[in-house]
């Protein structure tokens, strides 16, 4: 039930009245407005932009609204010397060379300031020699490679394909293996949906589309110079050859066209199986190096693109809680896109710009928020998520002690079959109720809530009647108030089918092709995806901000750490006998979940029945709420990722886009058999046992009555 | 130490199927391929198909036109080989070797398809 | 699909001396032949892969050549327990194809 009664206003301003504000129409303008231009980091028009946005939510009755600036690592192509890659003969002639741009959209073909395809932060080389496809470079990819089929990358060049895991983590990965280049390219299989056009016709990758990305190994960051603290005016600053998460190998991206004249060449050794092939039709041949006639040919890498500190501007909008103001709760997303960020990030842009609008309308009116709400318009974050980290680093200290929820707000689509949710758990029981009060915009559903659809589209894999809500993972914005700080967090989109689409996120992601036609024509005509995600984010931030009692449910942490216990330890009982003789134990997990079970379930006895009519019990109350995330927070960090600092939940090491629970133990426990030294791995997993049963117990006594 | 133990020897009628099962010990299940070859009685050896384990990827020699399925269950570390619609020229013994290189193989089964 | 052609058909060599196998592929495989060592009633085991890479625990007697299309399995001092039939076997290409091998026998 949505609760109004924190501020002594008139009864019609609830959260009806803000969601009733919402309008696709605006959603829609907002979107055209955002993307008829480039707006890349660092650049002068994201820096209008910035400014233009800060002028309107002033406009729509913000308290106020302040540009935040930094001056962070940014990369950029070199303008005249282009990157490319090409085979050469045996004497040394480009026999052939990849496209040095994207052909351009209709209707773009003037449009200046379009950055060419490449990997960010990619350093400078030109390395030439053999090819190796290595699939999707996960971690499995290279043990296949590596373990079974006895294929050596050192000093090679590694061709694979996009999806599955970040583009960082595949890169790392070829580092690992001793690679020399990577090129990555974007294979039908995973990037052209059977049945559908490519752009201009439909949502699908041409074959001279490509995408864009950063491929840097953060692990939370932010600036590559100045971990930890913030890029302002009298920062100190690591040399380059100190900075974090930077690639030591050439990287350039490349479409279909040119993979097919590359993988078509391929000799070796075949493909281990079916996983390996994608869609082209080519052999898909591992190598090492080209077949027969073309054995002699080489493939080599021309990049020049440099790394250069830029100034870069968040936009920080202040809405002032009327009760409870030094509480935040903060709805961010980015501004800067790779061209013209048709879906990343305007399509989440304009429905933060139409959820401030609301607000604001709401507040000309005489309402306030309880709380104080901030929203943010996040620079860089294609960069590494740069804007929102050196922002948060600035505001640690004031985050840490009044920072009740984050809420994200990139893309606000990646399909349109069903809502996406991924979040804590204090936040199930929010998402389930306010999507019980909207309505659902899917075609079939006339009538019903958000929540059926929801939930027979795609439901729980463990619950009857539920949907999935899956792990926070990283890759956006929320990193680093969930992952270092401890905010609850959550994310919400609409997105494809997964069971009919095995594609990696959408085919024109970071492509020159992700233009307002993309979703005006293809993905929302009528705006009411858009529309569904903008109540689904500004209901989130409503309730947070104006709730009595913080809609956070502890029990339903209970439950996930149960889940995740009983995981961690069928991954250890897959080694019986190490686990016998080293004397590994999960009990003191077990009696820790178990601990926080009681202890969670008599708290919210307790919330159920407490005066809260009296401030000093509210406030006591909502502050254990507010601050039981902040418990899973471990202040030296995971091992080799201090950034990363929640215990229950961290980016995955082998893909930085999926979460993992319990990653302590589960990266201790990863590949372990392989290990030379078994006594000092295993050591390691009874101490990330210790550390995760502390945590959880820990996290349960501030639940705990206070005396 | 690496060891395939392969299922006991099958006497099969025309038209039938047969399902061999290989358990494997001694390494990491999912990291190594599984392949499944056939040798007829004092013949060479013949591929018919391989599996990933992690992932279930499979690949099949065409020769057996959808006659054969390759399978794995990860709980127990062990593939199976099932040939249907069995004939008489079907007759061999069937081997599972782990890893792409073939690095380790089990001891066979003898498959004798008889009216 | 690739054929792998074995020559000779069999071998007779005093113990001591050399054996040089020989392993054609219809089409260009690259390094990719494997070579197999199978005793009367036992199952084939690995011997050379990647055309010239010895196997775990495989002496050193025996040793892989060529890429291409032409290939070699040398064994340079036979000894009785290398009494056995020799396959050799392309990864290159789907079907994988091993050749009819070759019967190895002490003079």
């Known amino acids: 039930k949505s609760s109004n009664e924190a501020t002594n206003i008139t009864p019609k301003h609830n959260m009806k009245a803000f969601l009733d504000e919402l309008k696709a129409e605006n959603i829609k303008k907002f979107l055209y407005n955002f993307t008829q231009i480039p707006h890349l980091a660092g650049t002068e028009q994201n820096f209008q932009l910035a400014k233009q946005i800060q002028s309107q939510w002033k406009e729509f009755g913000l308290d106020s609204v302040e540009l935040a600036h930094y001056d962070v690592l940014l990369s950029y192509p070199n303008k005249t010397h282009p990157n490319y890659i090409s085979i050469i003969n045996e004497d040394g002639n480009e026999i052939f060379n990849t496209s040095l741009f994207e052909p351009p959209p209709p209707g773009y073909e003037n449009v200046s300031d379009i950055v060419p395809p490449f990997s960010a932060f990619s350093p400078q080389g030109m390395p030439e020699g053999d090819l190796v496809y290595v699939n999707y470079a996960r971690t499995e990819d290279f043990f296949k490679l590596e373990r079974d089929m006895k294929i050596n990358c050192s000093g090679k060049i590694v061709i694979a394909r996009y999806g599955k895991v970040f583009r960082g983590n595949k890169v790392k990965n070829a580092q690992l293996a001793g690679a020399k280049g990577v090129i990555l390219y974007s294979d039908p299989a995973d990037y052209f949906a059977p049945g559908v056009k490519s752009y201009p016709d439909g949502w699908n990758l041409p074959g001279g589309g490509v995408q864009r990305g950063n491929i840097l190994n953060l692990n939370g960051a932010g600036d590559p110079l100045t971990p930890g603290y913030p890029a302002n005016e009298y920062a100190y600053r690591r040399g380059i050859a100190e900075a974090v998460g930077l690639p030591s190998i050439p990287v350039h991206p490349i479409g279909y066209y040119d993979a097919q004249k590359l993988l078509e060449k391929m000799g070796g050794s075949a493909p281990p199986d079916s996983s390996w092939r994608g869609s082209l039709k080519v052999p898909y041949n591992v190598g090492p190096g080209f077949t027969g006639n073309f054995s002699t040919q080489k493939v080599k890498m021309h990049i020049h693109s440099t790394n250069e500190v830029t100034r870069i501007y968040n936009v920080i909008g202040t809405l002032r809680g009327a009760v409870e103001p030094d509480r935040y709760v903060i709805l961010g997303g980015h501004r800067d896109s790779w061209v013209f960020g048709g879906i990343d990030p305007q399509s989440g842009a304009a429905v933060v710009h139409e959820i401030v609008r609301s607000f604001g309308t709401l507040k000309k009116e005489g309402w306030r928020p309880r709380r104080t709400i901030l929203f943010a318009s996040w620079d860089a974050e294609e960069f590494g998520l740069l804007g929102s980290t050196e922002w948060a680093e600035e505001n640690s200290r004031l985050l840490q002690e009044r920072g009740v929820a984050y809420i994200n707000a990139d893309s606000s689509i990646e399909g349109n079959y069903t809502l996406r949710v991924d979040c804590t758990p204090l936040m199930y029981s929010l998402v389930h109720n306010l999507t019980k009060e909207l309505k659902s915009p899917d075609e079939g559903f006339e009538g019903k809530s958000l929540y059926e659809s929801w939930t027979k589209k795609s439901p729980s894999p463990e619950f009857s009647g539920m949907p999935r809500i899956s792990k926070l993972g990283s890759g956006n914005d929320f990193e680093v108030f969930f992952q270092r700080l401890g905010i609850a967090s959550g994310r919400a989109r609409y997105t494809k089918n997964w069971e009919t689409n095995k594609f990696s996120g959408y085919p024109l992601y970071h492509s020159v092709y992700e233009t307002y036609e993309l979703v005006e024509k293809f993905y929302d005509p009528m705006f009411k995806y858009h529309l569904t995600v903008a109540q689904v984010r500004g209901g989130m931030v409503f309730e947070l901000a104006n709730s009595i009692v913080l809609p956070f449910d502890c029990r339903d942490y209970a439950v996930v750490l149960r889940k995740y216990a009983d995981k961690i330890y069928s991954i250890s009982m897959k080694h019986p006998q190490e686990m016998k003789t080293y004397s590994v134990s999960f009990d003191s997990l077990f009696s820790a979940v178990k601990n926080f079970t009681e202890i969670a379930s008599k708290f919210s006895e307790r919330l159920q029945d407490f005066d809260k009519s009296n401030p000093i019990v509210l406030r006591m109350m909502n502050d254990q709420l507010m601050f039981l995330e902040r418990a899973f927070i471990d202040p030296l960090g995971l091992p080799d990722r201090p950034f990363y600092r929640h215990v229950i939940y961290a980016p995955s090491s082998h893909n930085k886009y999926a979460g993992e629970s319990f990653p302590g133990i589960y990266d201790a426990l990863f590949d372990i058999e392989s290990k030379v030294d078994p006594s000092k791995a295993w050591g390691e997993v009874k101490r990330q046992i210790y550390v995760a049963a502390f945590t959880v117990q820990a996290a349960a006594e501030t639940l705990s009555e206070v005396a | 130490e690496v060891q395939l133990v392969q299922s006991g020897a099958e006497v099969k009628k025309p038209g039938a199927s047969v399902k061999v099962s290989c358990k494997t010990s001694?390494?990491?299940?999912?990291?190594?391929?599984i392949h499944w070859v056939r040798q007829a009685p004092g013949q060479s050896l013949e591929w018919m198909g391989n599996?990933?384990?992690?992932?279930?990827?499979?690949t099949y020699n065409q020769k057996f036109q959808g006659r054969v399925t390759i399978t794995v269950d990860k709980s127990t570390s062990t593939a199976y080989m099932e040939l249907s619609s069995l004939r008489s020229e079907d007759t061999a013994v069937y081997y599972c070797?782990?890893?792409?290189?073939?690095?380790?193989w089990g001891q066979g089964t003898l498959v004798t398809v008889s009216s | 699909d690739i054929v792998m052609t074995q020559s000779p058909d069999s071998l007779a060599v005093s113990l001591g001396e050399r054996a040089t196998l020989s392993c054609r592929a219809s089409?260009?495989?690259?390094?990719?032949v494997d070579w197999y060592q199978q005793k009367p009633d036992q199952s084939p085991k690995l011997l050379i892969y990647?055309?010239?890479t010895r196997h775990t625990g495989v002496p050193d007697r025996f040793t892989g050549s060529g890429s291409g299309t032409d290939f070699t399995l040398t064994i340079s001092s036979l000894q009785a327990e290398d009494v056995a039939v020799y396959f050799c076997?392309?990864?290159?290409?789907?079907?994988?194809?091993f050749g009819a091998g070759t019967k190895v026998e002490i003079k």
């Open positions: 070797a782990a890893g792409w290189n073939f690095d380790y």
């Open positions: 076997q392309q990864k290159n290409s789907y079907p994988l194809t």
């Open positions: 599996i990933n384990p992690n992932n279930g990827g499979t």
């Open positions: 001694g390494y990491t299940f999912t990291e190594y391929t």
């Open positions: 089409q260009d495989v690259g390094t990719a």
């Open positions: 990647w055309a010239s």
